[in-house]
């Protein structure tokens, strides 16, 4: 009761910013922890289809909104054909995975590679074959696949015909696509992600116009898109839960991304309130309906009365609890450029440990998969990516502290990314891969960077040994 009165939000994530040592859950005294991760900790690495596959119109693949956006909005980028060409060089990706020794590989299926116009009819045979071959190869290697159904590459036909995620017609179309994937791949996939970082889909796709489809300044559309993404996710979860989980025995979630923020004045309750509001407006927007009470955060409902859609009581009941674990993304896409609306005049921070503590407090200590984490280097950096190692060590140390000192239930970690590739609005100006790829080369060899060697060692030792 008191918390609602003070902050206007139902959870108690505010405690994170309290500098009272008896109150704040994060003990800052342990700056670096030499320790191991829990036994059977799930180590993995990830990619997004549009970022690495290339072959944007090869073998019957249909165009996506990003293929279109690249040609119309991004200067100096001819297409994702340059990319790492994972569609052609599947074996090279598998060798890279073998080199690192991961327990899982998180990748996304390109919806238009399976269904060129987005509608589930007869699948594109070459696309189906590619993903089937990849899954078989992973199973053979004892690498668990974590499969994302939607990592931003909406079939262009659905954008042009329906207006994309602005139109709730797409909810059923997405569910049909998901059903097909469960039917065809579910025997080999135990972990599913419906949508990767819906916040960025809505905010940058329809607010800033920095992402496809490049619409700008329509806050009503931003929140309508968010609403439809949540409902689509929920529908797919219920579908999986009812029709596929009983025999496939898998888990399904949605990857939610966020920044982290610190108050200008740690003793100032209104600065703390602004930090809470900031987290709620980004992470809470999607986490509250799915991992919380089934509705949007109270503060959002009050402030955004003219643009935020309303969930009926039945819908709230339907949304609530539609994730089997909390899949969390913490990386540069949520930091640069940061929505100034979310910044609230406070200080952005890369403290993953505190973000995990906030999730623990707000959403009743869920099991957490770090579904994307890492940083970036300038495109000129080749294999000596010392900054990436520094950032990885820092992030992993924070995850370990969260597990060991704060009793947060993180069960897996996805380093991002396996390969250098197409980095959305940054195109090819930055690199996020643990493997270097020369985009101008014919063979697109995957060369392990220093960070790949480092991550391999972390996995082998299951943490940091003295």
């Amino acid at each position: 009761i008191l918390l609602r009165a003070v902050t206007g939000f139902s959870g108690d994530g505010r405690a994170i910013w309290s500098k009272n040592p008896n109150f704040t859950p994060v003990n800052e005294s342990q700056l670096f922890l030499y320790d191991t991760f829990p036994k059977n900790f799930f180590w993995g690495i990830g990619t997004g289809a549009l970022q690495v596959e290339g072959s944007w119109k090869k073998d019957g693949k249909g165009p996506s909104i990003w293929d279109h956006f690249i040609h119309t909005h991004l200067k100096n980028v001819s297409s994702t054909n340059g990319s790492s060409d994972s569609y052609i060089f599947l074996e090279k990706d598998l060798s890279a995975l073998d080199f690192i020794g991961v327990s899982f590989y998180q990748f996304s299926i390109s919806w238009p590679r399976l269904f060129p116009d987005g509608i589930v009819t007869v699948a594109n045979a070459k696309g189906l074959q590619y993903y089937s071959t990849l899954l078989d190869a992973l199973v053979l290697r004892n690498i668990e696949p974590i499969v994302t159904l939607y990592h931003w590459d909406l079939p262009l036909a659905l954008q042009e015909k329906y207006g994309g995620w602005k139109n709730d017609t797409i909810i059923d179309i997405f569910n049909d696509y998901a059903t097909y994937c469960f039917q065809m791949f579910g025997d080999r996939v135990k972990y599913w992600i419906t949508i990767h970082n819906p916040y960025l889909v809505a905010w940058h796709g329809y607010g800033t116009g920095m992402h496809a489809p490049g619409e700008k300044g329509n806050l009503a559309a931003v929140y309508t898109v968010g609403h439809n993404l949540i409902k689509a996710h929920s529908k797919v979860w219920h579908n999986y839960n009812t029709h596929f989980r009983p025999h496939q025995k898998g888990w399904l979630s949605i990857t939610l991304g966020s920044h982290w923020i610190e108050p200008n004045r740690s003793e100032n309750t209104m600065d703390i309130f602004k930090c809470q509001q900031s987290m709620v407006s980004v992470l809470g927007w999607f986490a509250n309906p799915i991992h919380g009470d089934g509705d949007y955060p109270e503060g959002m409902r009050k402030k955004l009365f003219s643009v935020l859609p309303i969930f009926s009581e039945a819908e709230k009941h339907e949304m609530r609890g539609t994730a089997d674990f909390f899949a969390f993304s913490f990386g540069p896409n949520n930091f640069k450029p940061l929505n100034t609306m979310a910044k609230m005049g406070q200080n952005v921070s890369l403290n993953l440990r505190e973000a995990l503590n906030w999730i623990k407090l707000e959403y009743n200590n869920p099991r957490i998969l770090i579904a994307e984490n890492g940083w970036f280097t300038d495109s000129r950096v080749k294999t000596e990516d010392t900054t990436a190692i520094y950032m990885m060590k820092n992030f992993l140390s924070q995850v370990l502290q969260a597990i060991r000192l704060d009793e947060i239930r993180v069960f897996g970690y996805t380093a991002w990314s396996l390969l250098d590739g197409f980095e959305w609005q940054d195109a090819y100006t930055i690199r996020r891969g643990l493997f270097y790829v020369d985009f101008n080369s014919k063979q697109k060899e995957r060369k392990p960077k220093s960070s790949a060697h480092y991550y391999k060692q972390i996995i082998r030792e299951n943490g940091f040994s003295l």
Partner: antibody, heavy 119, light 107 residues
């Protein structure tokens, strides 16, 4: 800097309609709702409703439903509020105000337009 | 509709005095309360949002507090330019509603 400049004073007869304009500058007009608030002589402030300049969507206070229409012309960054079936108690200063989503508050206001309803 | 009451309806104080206005909501509005200043013939001005957040450029002598149903607005040291009518406003529920205002002048 952000400015909302409203049209001049109006004198209307009972039963007539009045249309007040509000020209915005200094920010992206389509990114923030315009709300209308009035103040009758010697009274407090009374909220009339909102209009989203991007979509044209509107929401009106129950009291004004059926009598008020809020529109916009994005080509000239101008919002309009039309009140019909005027009566003497509609005599008031009418303000347009930019709504700040972050604050849940009206962070910039027009200078007001005096509307007098008299026979 | 949520009713907002303000007291006093008017007050006179000397320059340098501490002035406090109260605002009461007819139901719990949490922290969804703003304060505005209105001077005759001028555009209203946002002073405080979400109970106690000072809008950029507003002097620090203005402050706000409270939560739930009872709120206060304080001018720590009254200045001649503060002569105006002050309004509280809730946005916990539609329709948005304002208090009746408190007129402040100099003795």
């Amino acid at each position: 800097q952000v400015q909302l400049v409203q049209s001049g004073a109006e004198v209307k007869k009972p039963g007539a309609s009045v249309k007040v304009s509000c020209k915005a500058s200094g920010y992206t007009f389509t990114s923030y709702d315009i709300n209308w608030v009035r103040q009758a002589t010697g009274q407090g402030l009374e909220w009339m409703g909102w209009m989203n300049p991007h979509s044209g969507n509107t929401g009106y206070a129950q009291k004004f439903q059926g009598r008020v229409t809020m529109t916009r012309d994005t080509s000239i960054n101008t919002a309009y509020m039309e009140l019909s079936s005027l009566r003497s108690e509609d005599t008031a200063v009418y303000y347009c105000a930019k709504y700040n989503w972050n604050y849940g508050a009206f962070d910039f206001w027009g200078q007001g337009t005096m509307v007098t309803v008299s026979s | 509709d949520i009713q907002m009451a303000q007291s006093p309806s008017s007050l006179s104080a000397s320059v340098g005095d501490r002035v406090t206005i109260t605002c009461q909501a007819s139901q719990d509005i949490s922290i969804y309360l703003n304060w505005y200043q209105l001077k005759p013939g001028k555009a209203p001005k946002l002073l405080i949002y979400d109970v106690s957040n000072l809008e950029t450029g507003v002097p620090s002598r203005f402050s706000g507090g409270g939560s739930g149903t009872d709120f206060t607005f304080t001018i720590s040291s009254l200045q001649p330019e503060d002569v105006a009518t002050y309004y509280c406003q809730q946005y916990d529920n539609l329709p948005l509603t304002f208090g009746p205002g408190t007129k402040v002048d100099i003795k």
